[in-house]
């Protein structure tokens, strides 16, 4: 089955139209947007949910603003262009023929350009920074029980091998949750850090994108651990083009 | 065609080493996890560990505290279980196993290897 | 670590029968639960992932079901090659993934 058994639904993606339409009857979905197949048992790719998002009802909302070489997603949601698995297309264009670069999250990672603008590959995310301050609690969670919740969140809500999970810092209030995976380390199942990020970041924000599954009650030895901000920092293996205009 | 061929059979002496070899074929060896499951004789598979051949990265089960040690060779294509401090209950087919990343299913199997440990 | 616990521990069944394992998880593993087939003397051989998807050669016969912590694997209509034994495999949390005991199935 490529979802649910029963009720043919998508537990991991919610924005998809599902109907036993599959080989043998078996329930097959389809991304919203892109009319896309997904596989219901993994994430599916951030620029697949993206542009699912744009093709349904919407508030907009504006992300974070960006810090030195490392990118933040300031320019909010955009409708992508997705390649047949789903990825990024390396050059993404508006409406209005103004186009730019991206990274492998879907990050702009150059000046905005025209048509003739060229995108040579997909840079790939290999490190993702998620800045995280929780609410005040009682005391600060002990780092090491912190540390295995949030490893044991990722490779079961997000399906993310903890291997590819580099580090969890904590400095009370703050949790830093670093992510690092290159091309070669990934191997066949394993799930992309900028997928896993983008699902844990709408579910920090009351937007799970989870099918009938409640929302993310993250606990760390009984105490809830509630996010009151978060920030995401994402890293390339090849350095963004911005020019000295944009950086003063 | 994906094949799995491993090492022969090992009798050992209690407190010794063994080390078993897997060499992989018909498939990109560094493009899927490897485990290594073993079964003594009359019971039920036992998951050992597993690495990326790509980076080397391993996870263990902590039953082995430190006893299985798991490493691979890019150049062939190959990747060895090492267990050491073994003892009468260690005796066992060792197999390894091709894995995914995702459902944690196990779609390719070695022939096993049989390691007695006797004294 | 998750405990996987399998009944029955052996079955006698005829040719033609169906025959139903069930295979139960100490705690949830939402839908990452595998199904292997054993012959004496041979490695184990994947039937079924992720609960219902049937790998690639494995006769339609074959199939699975369930979420959560209670699954099953049945066998439509039991063919002589079937008889083996039966383990169920969990592959949702941290390492170590765990195996059930084992079913044995038995020519009745």
């Known amino acids: 089955h490529t979802a649910a058994q029963d009720n043919c639904t998508c537990p991991t993606n919610k924005m998809t139209v599902c109907s036993p339409d599959g080989p043998g009857g078996r329930c097959q979905c389809r991304a919203l947007g892109s009319g896309m197949a997904v596989d219901c048992s993994t994430l599916t790719s951030k620029c697949l949910l993206l542009k699912a998002r744009m093709s349904a009802p919407k508030n907009a909302r504006t992300l974070v603003r960006p810090s030195e070489h490392a990118l933040v997603d300031n320019d909010g949601l955009y409708d992508p262009d997705c390649d047949p698995e789903g990825r990024f297309k390396a050059r993404q264009c508006n409406q209005t023929s103004v186009c730019w670069c991206v990274n492998s999250v879907g990050v702009r990672r150059t000046d905005k350009g025209d048509l003739s603008l060229r995108c040579d590959e997909l840079v790939r995310t290999h490190h993702i920074l998620i800045d995280l301050r929780h609410r005040p609690t009682a005391g600060a969670f002990n780092h090491s029980d912190l540390d295995a919740e949030l490893r044991r969140l990722f490779r079961e809500r997000y399906r993310l091998h903890p291997k590819f999970v580099a580090a969890v810092h904590y400095e009370q209030p703050t949790i830093q949750i670093e992510l690092r995976q290159n091309t070669s380390q990934k191997a066949a199942g394993d799930v992309d850090i900028g997928d896993a990020a983008y699902y844990f970041e709408r579910d920090i924000k009351g937007e799970s994108l989870f099918q009938g599954r409640g929302g993310l009650d993250l606990r760390v030895r009984g105490e809830p651990l509630q996010v009151e901000r978060t920030l995401i920092y994402y890293l390339d293996e090849i350095p963004p083009k911005f020019s000295m205009k944009r950086l003063t | 065609q994906v094949q799995l061929v491993q090492s022969g059979a090992e009798v050992k002496k209690p407190g010794a080493s063994v080390k078993v070899s897997c060499k992989a074929s018909g498939y990109t060896f560094t493009s899927y996890w490897m485990h290594w499951v073993r079964q003594a004789p009359g019971q039920g598979l036992e998951w050992m560990g597993e690495i990326t051949p790509s980076d080397g990265y391993t996870s263990y089960n902590q039953k082995f505290k430190g006893r299985v040690t798991i490493t691979r060779d890019t150049s062939t294509s190959t990747a060895y279980m090492e267990l050491s401090s073994l003892r009468s209950e260690d005796t066992a087919v060792y197999y390894c196993?091709?894995?995914?990343?995702?459902?944690?299913?196990?779609?390719?199997w070695g022939q096993g290897t049989l390691v007695t440990v006797s004294s | 670590d998750i405990q996987m616990t399998q009944s029955p521990s052996s079955l006698s069944a005829s040719v033609g029968d169906r025959v139903t394992i069930t295979c139960r998880a100490s705690?949830?593993?939402?839908?990452?639960l595998n199904w292997y087939q054993q012959k004496p003397g041979k490695a184990p051989k994947l039937l079924i992932y992720y609960t219902s998807r049937l790998q690639s050669g494995v006769p339609s016969r074959f199939s699975g079901s369930g979420s959560g912590t209670d699954f099953t694997l049945t066998i439509s209509s039991l063919q002589p090659e079937d008889f083996a034994t039966y383990f169920c495999?969990?592959?949702?949390?941290?390492?170590?993934?765990?195996f059930g005991q084992g079913t044995k199935l038995e020519i009745k």
């Open positions: 495999q969990q592959g949702y949390t941290l390492p170590p993934y765990t």
């Open positions: 705690q949830d593993i939402s839908n990452y």
């Open positions: 196993a091709r894995g995914h990343g995702n459902y944690v299913s196990f779609d390719y």
